[in-house]
């Protein structure tokens, strides 16, 4: 059974992931972003189901495409380099989902824009955090 300390650690990691995803969204979904129109043409795969930590496998598999789109953004728009940002997210995702269980991600039929993709994973984080508190 999860201990209160492990629950607290999970909550903190999810909060960190949530802030990173929100920060990326804030840098993209903005009228001041000169590359917004271009960025919205890229398509991302969405999870069929995202209710448990193991489903973060679906986010992990889309981190490389996410980094490629972020590389389009002007350096001015991103405090951290996209590579560093995605690397940070990857570390958190790996810790949260655990590496001992192999989960095959199932994707929805419809693809999504980067904004829809980020909003989906932000909602996921908020949802899991609310069950932990």
């Amino acid at each position: 059974a999860p201990t209160s300390s492990s629950t607290k650690k999970t909550q903190l990691q999810l909060e960190h992931l949530l802030l990173d995803l929100q920060m990326i969204l804030n840098g993209i979904n903005n009228y001041k972003n000169p590359k917004l129109t271009r960025m919205l043409t890229f398509k991302f795969y969405m999870p069929k189901k995202a209710t448990e930590l193991k489903h973060l496998q679906c986010l992990e598999e889309e981190l490389k495409p996410l980094e490629e789109v972020l590389n389009l953004a002007q350096s001015k728009n991103f405090h951290l380099r996209p590579r560093d940002l995605i690397s940070n997210i990857n570390v958190i995702v790996l810790e949260l989902k655990g590496s001992e269980t192999t989960f095959m991600c199932e994707y929805a039929d419809e693809t999504a824009t980067i904004v829809e993709f980020l909003n989906r994973w932000i909602t996921f984080c908020q949802s899991i955090i609310s069950t932990l508190t």
Epitope: G27, Y31, K32, L36, T37
Partner: antibody, heavy 121, light 111 residues
């Protein structure tokens, strides 16, 4: 002095069109992004649309998308808002506001006095 | 869209006394460029809005130093240290971290 003056408001029937103007003076208009923000009677502020300093990008609130068009003429220091298929819920005071975000982003630092649009049959 | 929620919606204050308005955003307003684009606007009766504070705590030019802004992330506050008669009006918080959204407004009136 730095000034924004809106004009073109009036009473219009639902489904009809109206074009608002915003004349800028006292500053270099061509380096500023420009917004339209509206305020329904007795209500709060609602962002409507923005256009980039050079006219290269424009964005709209969902409530006006496909009906309103923002444009600008930097040679005339003027911002426009073409409003088509007007609805009763578009009734509001329309303000133009400037914003510069390349150098020092102060947000919307100068606002016009507003022009009133009333949509009624 | 980011939802901005202000409290209180009405604030009756005594002249010379302090006033405080809170604003909460539905998500973090920290932009990837490191800035937090949270502004405060004042709208006096019959007047257009006027910028008071930008990027959380920076007073815009000509704004009296009795106005101050603070906060971080999702929680922000506008304080008026000593309310004067000319401060009567509606105050709005506004974010431009994403597409602009405003709080509902807080009416400051004299008791």
């Amino acid at each position: 002095q730095v000034q924004l003056v809106e004009s073109g408001g009036g009473v219009v029937q639902p489904g009809r069109s109206l074009r608002l103007s915003c004349a800028a003076s006292g500053f270099t208009f061509s380096i500023y992004g420009m917004h339209w923000v509206r305020q329904a009677p007795g209500k709060g502020l609602e962002w409507v649309t923005v256009i980039w300093y050079d006219g290269s990008n424009e964005y709209y609130a969902d409530s006006v998308k496909g009906r309103f068009t923002i444009s600008r003429d930097n040679s005339k220091n003027t911002l426009y808002l073409q409003m088509n298929s007007l609805r009763a819920e578009d009734t509001a005071v329309y303000y133009c506001a400037r914003e510069e975000w390349e150098l020092e982003d102060y947000g919307m630092d100068v606002w016009g006095q507003g022009t009133t649009v009333t949509v009624s049959s | 869209d980011i939802v901005m929620t202000q409290t209180p919606l009405s604030s009756p204050v005594t002249l010379g006394q302090p006033a405080s308005i809170s604003c909460r955003s539905s998500q973090s307003l920290v932009h990837s460029d490191g800035n937090t684009y949270l502004s405060w606007l004042q709208q006096r009766p019959g007047q257009p809005p006027r910028l008071l504070i930008y990027k959380i705590s920076n007073r815009f030019s000509g704004v009296p130093d009795r106005f101050s802004g603070s906060g971080a992330g999702t929680d922000f506050t506008l304080k008026i240290s000593r309310v004067e008669a000319e401060d009567v009006g509606v105050y709005y918080c506004m974010q431009t971290t994403q597409f602009p959204t405003f709080g509902q407004g807080t009416k400051v009136e004299i008791k």
